[in-house]
Amino acid sequence: QRKRRNTIHEFKKSAKTTLIKIDPALKIKTKKVNTADQCANRCTRNKGLPFTCKAFVFDKARKQCLWFPFNSMSSGVKKEFGHEFDLYENKDYIRNCIIGKGRSYKGTVSITKSGIKCQPWSSMIPHEHSFLPSSYRGKDLQENYCRNPRGEEGGPWCFTSNPEVRYEVCDIPQCSEVECMTCNGESYRGLMDHTESGKICQRWDHQTPHRHKFLPERYPDKGFDDNYCRNPDGQPRPWCYTLDPHTRWEYCAIKTCADNTMNDTDVPLETTECIQGQGEGYRGTVNTIWNGIPCQRWDSQYPHEHDMTPENFKCKDLRENYCRNPDGSESPWCFTTDPNIRVGYCSQIPNCDMSHGQDCYRGNGKNYMGNLSQTRSGLTCSMWDKNMEDLHRHIFWEPDASKLNENYCRNPDDDAHGPWCYTGNPLIPWDYCPISRCEGDTTPTIVNLDHPVISCAKTKQLRVVNGIPTRTNIGWMVSLRYRNKHICGGSLIKESWVLTARQCFPSRDLKDYEAWLGIHDVHGRGDEKCKQVLNVSQLVYGPEGSDLVLMKLARPAVLDDFVSTIDLPNYGCTIPEKTSCSVYGWGYTGLINYDGLLRVAHLYIMGNEKCSQHHRGKVTLNESEICAGAEKIGSGPCEGDYGGPLVCEQHKMRMVLGVIVPGRGCAIPNRPGIFVRVAYYAKWIHKIILTYKVPQS
């Protein structure tokens, strides 16, 4: 059985409108129906109607059709508002242009190309002919209107009223000529309703044959009227879903208007130094993505092929390789010159309306309600409501949604280090905001530092790979190399993550670094079988003032007899005084004939107060520091050891309790070493590991 064609696409809809006939001679036909589609089918086929149907009204309340032999342009008729009514007018009768050869043209032009008045179709004067309205039913040979009943090449024509000229074509423009757009047609609100290959467009308020998200009620500002071509999503030009089940969508052939200007309402506010809204109007010259990778030129197809060209997006200022937002993305972006990274956001461009108030927070900032919305590295914060799923993934209670408004910096997870936000940048999912604690605020974020309230060790035993302890159990030691030389130590805390010190990264170019694992000799001599050399893919800087860095490896380390991870302590834990610990490193030894082998120095934990006394009161330790003194005078960490761990054992479990950072001198006799207290930053470490993506092995 042949599927009945859905003809409602041939009608122009005017919601909440009906037609009232002033002329009583005009006929109307009514009938109860279920849908407007049924009305449309009957109107198109003129089935059971005593007139040529040009329009209909669907009464939604009474489920009734009113068919008319007239439309809103006819004389003796007026439009009227009515909540329950929708007016549908056959587009062929209101269109003043032709599609293709104009076979369906039913407009009212009645003058030929050279200006001669047309002869009525029902008349044989001055020219006899066989084109009688009765012979060409459905071709609307009414009055003396130009028509093309046989679909001939020249388009609509008529017999002329001049006896010397039998017939002539009428000068009716192609719809694709009449219709024009500015830029890429995002503001186009014309009546083009077919694609460049001639397919009829699907109505936006229909979901057949193609289901889609562009519902007129959901996007009232996008002009989703009837089945007209539109550009709601920043494509190069207007398009539509088609009635062909095998062609989901196609572009429409709409030319660019000669006077290519935009209405003031269409122009986003242009800025050059900062981003307003989503940055559609950004016209500055930043030409790298957030991490410094340069942008590809918009007019280039290398290394990435794309259709975001200056020709396709005429008003989007796709000059050079500047960051732009031509397609309504979250913020300005570009294709990158790195063949492995197609696109990236230029989220380092500041927000114009960013608050620069001298904000501060108390305690850990969980009650901070300021309106800063930028991270410490200058990335614009992303809206909280877009990130609730991620937030739920790392907190186990319901966050206070009333505090999480817009994209302001907040602390919904009770982070010890202050307000933060999500960034919308896949490589830096979240970061802290540049807000300090209020002056004079002494609220501790961890209490009872020198009293062993929380044990540092988790309950599990020391892990031994395959039942054999790793060589002297230092498989977690990492040698960080800077331009092929050892520069610092580090601790492998997860297959893809090394904990080390901020000062170990003199250069911002990650290509300058490598991580060596599984070695005992700093030059890797004799370690060939067990050595793993890994590139560095990212540095995640610790909270302000922490001196910590989590270094992400380009691929995960393979854990084996020579490479293992070391455990982290519980957050906020304290380790008893006099606990024996060790520092490891390949650094300066004081020996002239240094053999390059990993060294260990044994230290014991000292309380912060006592430690301060040993430093003659010149140093006040805070909750983020831990102190350990040497058993042997003059032994302790030095240059080359920085970034390495202070390792302690509790309940037969070894953990990295401290990180060696510069600033306290080299193994000075009677001066205990001061380390970064890892327990204070344990939550931050876990949060990074949980939220940052790592490459799969």
Epitope: T288, G292, P662, G663, G665
Partner: antibody, heavy 114, light 110 residues
Framework: VEESGGRLVTPGTPLTLTCTVS????????MSWVRQAPEKGLEWIAV?????ATDYASWAKGRFTISRTSTTVDLRIPSPTTEDTATYFC?????????????WGPGTLVTVSS | AYDMTQTPASVEVAVGGTVTIKCQAS??????LAWYQQKPGQPPKLLIY???KLASGVPSRFKGSGSGTEFTLTISGVECADAATYYC????????????FGGGTEVVVK
């Protein structure tokens, strides 16, 4: 930040310039040497980072050595040539790693001439 | 290498006018660029860091912009005191660098 040690030397005579710092600790800031030949532009020579690592301009490797104590940063020129005639500035880097310079000494003049 | 090219070498500007100095990096340095002003017989003075941030005590007529490889220092409403030589410096990496500084631009105020 104050430089010293600049003087007139003959080519090949080793020379050490010293930069003495006060009011801040070398355990918190990287330090650098920059020079400027008469009527010429600034030329970066070397940097010593907080962790003790060093970097040199590609032309300066082997011609200069940067080192430090707890309060001084030295630049050794083992075998100066006439092209090394310049005012030498010591500059504090605004960080423990490579960055911009936010504190400069007045400079010390080195003249290499036979 | 991350080497810097500065243009022009010299520029003349009238009091109250605007001067623009360009600096180009041989590779992307993100926003890690600083600008200095140097007057004869004096050490350089920091004006701008991280491409666009004004150093403390520097008048707001000095403006830095750009990122990646192209950077600009703009001095608007030029005053006599602005006659000096201006240098850019990359603060990204000194890996195989010939000079971290640009060649300098002399600004002559008429």
């Amino acid at each position: 930040v104050e430089e010293s040690g600049g003087r007139l030397v003959t080519p090949g005579t080793p020379l050490t310039l010293t930069c003495t710092v006060s009011g801040f600790s070398l355990s918190a800031y990287a330090m650098s040497w920059v020079r400027q030949a008469p009527e010429k532009g600034l030329e970066w020579i070397a940097v010593i980072y907080v962790i003790g690592a060093t970097d040199y301009a590609s032309w300066a490797k082997g011609r200069f050595t940067i080192s430090r104590t707890s309060t001084t940063v030295d630049l050794r020129i083992p075998s100066p040539t006439t092209e090394d005639t310049a005012t030498y500035f010591c500059a504090r880097v605004y960080d423990s790693v490579w960055n911009h310079f936010n504190l400069w000494g007045p400079g010390t003049l080195v003249t290499v001439s036979s | 290498a991350y080497d810097m090219t500065q243009t022009p070498a010299s520029v003349e500007v009238a009091v109250g006018g605007t001067v623009t100095i360009k600096c180009q990096a041989s590779q992307s340095i993100s926003s890690w660029l600083a600008w200095y002003q140097q007057k004869p017989g004096q050490p350089p003075k920091l004006l701008i860091y991280q491409a666009s941030k004004l150093a403390s005590g520097v008048p707001s007529r000095f403006k830095g912009s750009g990122s990646g490889t192209e950077f600009t220092l703009t001095i608007s409403g030029v005053e006599c005191a602005d006659a000096a030589t201006y240098y850019c410096q990359q603060a990204y990496s000194v890996s195989n660098v010939d000079n971290a500084f640009g060649g300098g631009t002399e600004v002559v105020v008429k």
